[in-house]
């Protein structure tokens, strides 16, 4: 349905509060270095303009596309060239090239200071003094650090952020009430950002066919009672929503997401019995709840897949008639029967099935050729099962910190060219899979673990794409989305790597180490561990363990000393010398 004024249409659909929030997010995700006040000014100008269009859709410029309106507004920023360099060249282009240009300049690792959390009283005062500005600041700070954050979901986080302050700033012990809530929002927010980044990478690097396949598998697991046609409709709608958000079309995305939530709640009977509790909630909460809803129970009477997909003599005929539909049906049928498989595994099975049909349907006796296709799935299934089993055993044996260290060593040996901060960040997150998934029952371990690892490895791929240093990483990241994790798992010690020269400065520590939080201390130690492996890639586990134990003892000793700085100055070189000797 066409509207005379797109901006008026979206303003009316979304309401002023959500409209302003989404425009602020869009602008902050594009111009990540701009000061808060500049963005607020731009948003207010756009909002006033939208209101004139609501009053009269025929008013001047109201018929322009949102990309044109927003792009024109962004290009009025005076310091564009000085702050963003070549991104300013985008403004010389016409739509749609201009928007594509802005998208290409989104920075996944912007050079922004880490967010420091002020004292609780300071935050509560700021919240009470100007609630609207306080919440806008939250949207701005998150959006500029996470340029692909799922915008309608960020509005939900902001609503929870507001609720936390409203409740806790009145509590007797404000800190005890507020800090755990803020920690939870921070951790959930980082996870949400990373999950959305994988969706956008899937769409942008591998196309909507890859995203649709992912969505068919995931929704079929969630809604095993739904018909294939119903799942297909949801997949089509969900693909549109995420394509829009990943493309910077945040108003359309939020509007379409609301429509999808409405449709799902109006058609619960043909989708899932688990939607009821979500559908009574207000919009933002409802959409979040629907996205996170647990898997419905599997129908009791599902027949064997073999009849239609192996034993039937019509397999090649059905495949030829509509390849993607037939493969989609296969994926749907397999996924609804296997909530215990990761989505990535299901996609690998569908890919293997497709390859078999491509080969066998060209044979004179296709049926004989594809008769054993399900047997070929066994090694594909066993590989992630074994990986999860082995790594969960290692996690239970070592605990999270030492498990992260084992992964740090493993990944540094695989891809030593990758920057140390990236290796530390990615390996720490890979290590969190243990606490997240290993405590779950067997049937939930693989989907939890492998699909989480896919999200973390996507972060490695995104950071590496910005500064490519390793052909191995490029290969694993670009060849196949579904085989990324197995590709990284299969990498071994890089024999071609020339060890990094020893730099004493890297292993020089000071008394400020003692005032760091436990997490910051771990990161310091893990940074040193990566540097050690880069210096001695063939060091054994025992050698590295010895050095790290000595390091922990040295830091503990100096942090207990009266003159901490003197202790670090004196003991530091001894530690370095002993470490070099141990690794010689």
């Amino acid at each position: 349905d066409t509207h005379k004024s797109e901006v008026a249409h979206r303003f009316k659909d979304l309401g002023e509060e959500h409209f302003k929030g989404l425009v602020l997010v869009a602008f902050s995700q594009y111009l990540q270095q701009c000061p808060f006040e500049e963005h607020v000014k731009l948003v207010n100008e756009v909002t006033e303009f939208a209101k004139t269009c609501v009053a009269d859709e025929s008013a001047e410029n109201c018929d322009k596309s949102l990309h044109t309106l927003f792009g024109d507004k962004l290009c009025t920023v005076a310091t564009l060239r000085e702050t963003y360099g070549e991104m300013a060249d985008c403004c010389a282009k016409q739509e749609p090239e201009r928007n594509e240009c802005f998208l290409q300049h989104k920075d996944d690792n912007p050079n922004l200071p880490p967010l420091v959390r002020p004292e609780v009283d300071v935050m509560c005062t700021a919240f009470h003094d100007n609630e609207a500005t306080f919440l806008k600041k939250y949207l701005y700070e998150v959006a500029r650090r996470h340029p692909y954050f799922y915008a309608p979901e960020l509005l939900f986080f902001a609503a929870r952020y507001k609720a936390a302050f409203a409740e806790c700033c009145q509590a007797a012990d404000k800190a005890a009430c507020l800090l755990p809530k803020l920690d939870e929002l921070r951790d959930e927010g980082k996870a949400s950002s990373a999950k959305q980044r994988l969706k956008c990478a899937s769409l942008q690097k591998f196309g909507d066919r890859a995203f649709k396949a992912w969505a068919v598998a995931r929704l079929s697991q969630k809604f095993p009672k739904a018909e294939f046609a119903e799942v297909s409709k949801l997949v089509t709608d969900l693909t549109k929503v995420h394509t829009e958000c990943c493309h910077g079309d945040l108003l359309e995305c939020a509007d379409d997401r609301a429509d999808l939530a409405k449709y799902m709640c109006e058609n619960q009977d043909s989708i899932s019995s688990k939607l009821k509790e979500c559908c009574d909630k207000p919009l933002l909460e409802k959409s979040h709840c629907l996205a996170e809803v647990e898997n419905d129970e599997m129908p009791a009477d599902l027949p064997s897949l073999a009849a239609d997909y192996v034993e039937s003599k019509d397999v090649c005929k059905n495949y030829a008639e509509a390849k993607d539909v037939f493969l989609g049906m296969f994926l749907y049928e397999y996924a609804r029967r296997h909530p215990d498989y990761s989505v990535m595994l299901l996609l690998r099975l569908a890919k293997a099935y497709e390859a078999t049909l491509e080969k066998c349907c060209a044979a004179a006796d296709p049926h004989e050729c594809y008769a054993k296709v399900f047997d070929e799935f066994q090694p594909l299934v066993e590989e992630p099962q074994n990986l999860v089993k082995q790594n969960c055993e290692l996690f239970e044996q070592l605990g999270e910190y030492k498990f992260q260290n084992a992964l740090l060593v493993r990944y540094t040996k695989k891809v030593p060219q990758v920057s140390t901060p990236t290796l530390v960040e990615v390996s720490r997150n890979l290590g969190k899979v243990g606490a997240k998934c290993c405590k779950l029952p067997e049937a939930k371990r693989m989907p939890c673990a492998e699909d989480y690892l896919s999200v973390v490895l996507n972060r490695l791929c995104v950071l590496h794409e910005k500064t490519p240093v390793s052909e191995k990483v490029t290969k694993c990241c670009t060849e196949s989305l579904v085989n990324r994790r197995p590709c990284f798992s299969a990498l071994e010690l890089d024999e071609a790597y020339v060890p990094k020269a020893f730099n004493a400065e890297t292993f020089t520590f000071h008394a400020d180490m003692c005032t760091l939080s436990e997490k910051e201390k771990q990161v310091k130690k893990q940074t040193a561990l990566v540097e050690l492996v880069k210096h001695k890639p063939k060091a054994t586990k025992e050698q590295l363990k010895g050095v790290m134990d000595n390091f922990a003892a040295f830091v503990e000793k100096c942090c207990k000393a009266d003159d901490k700085e003197a202790c670090f100055a004196e003991e530091g070189p001894k530690f370095v010398a002993a470490s070099q000797a141990a690794l010689a």
């Epitope: 003599k313 019509d314 090649c316 005929k317 006796d365 296709p366 049926h367």
Partner: nanobody, 115 residues
Framework: QVQLVESGGGLVQPGGSLRLSCAAS????????MSWVRQAPGKGPEWVSA????????RYAETVKGRFTISRDNAKKTLYLQMNSLKPEDTAVYYC????????GSQGTQVTVSS
């Protein structure tokens, strides 16, 4: 939409010959093995012959081996069945299928062998 249209059938005396053709459209013909299947009055479908996508590998039912020859022209998207030394028991509707399917996805062409 997949379409298979058979032609070349007719009435022939025992010992005679016929050449059936099957024109394909709506799918990548050159990527699929193809078969000929027949159905005699009051009987179920019977697989006759198959050929792989490139035309190198051919298979035949014992009842027609040495008399029938399957071939294909991928450029013309056409499948053929050369039938020699025809017998009364070869009387049936002949139709082509994708792969080794025996389900009728087309009208077929009638072959009658009678003196």
């Amino acid at each position: 939409q997949v379409q298979l249209v058979e032609s070349g059938g007719g009435l022939v005396q025992p010992g005679g010959s016929l050449r059936l053709s099957c024109a394909a459209s709506g799918f990548s013909f050159g990527s699929f093995g193809m078969s000929w299947v027949r159905q005699a009055p009051g009987k179920g479908p019977e697989w006759v012959s198959a050929i792989d996508s490139g035309g190198a590998d051919t298979r035949y039912a014992e009842t027609v081996k040495g008399r029938f020859t399957i071939s294909r022209d991928n450029a013309k998207k056409t499948l053929y069945l050369q039938m020699n030394s025809l017998k009364p028991e070869d009387t049936a509707v002949y139709y082509c299928t994708i792969g080794r399917s025996t389900s009728r996805g087309s009208q077929g062409t009638q072959v009658t062998v009678s003196s």
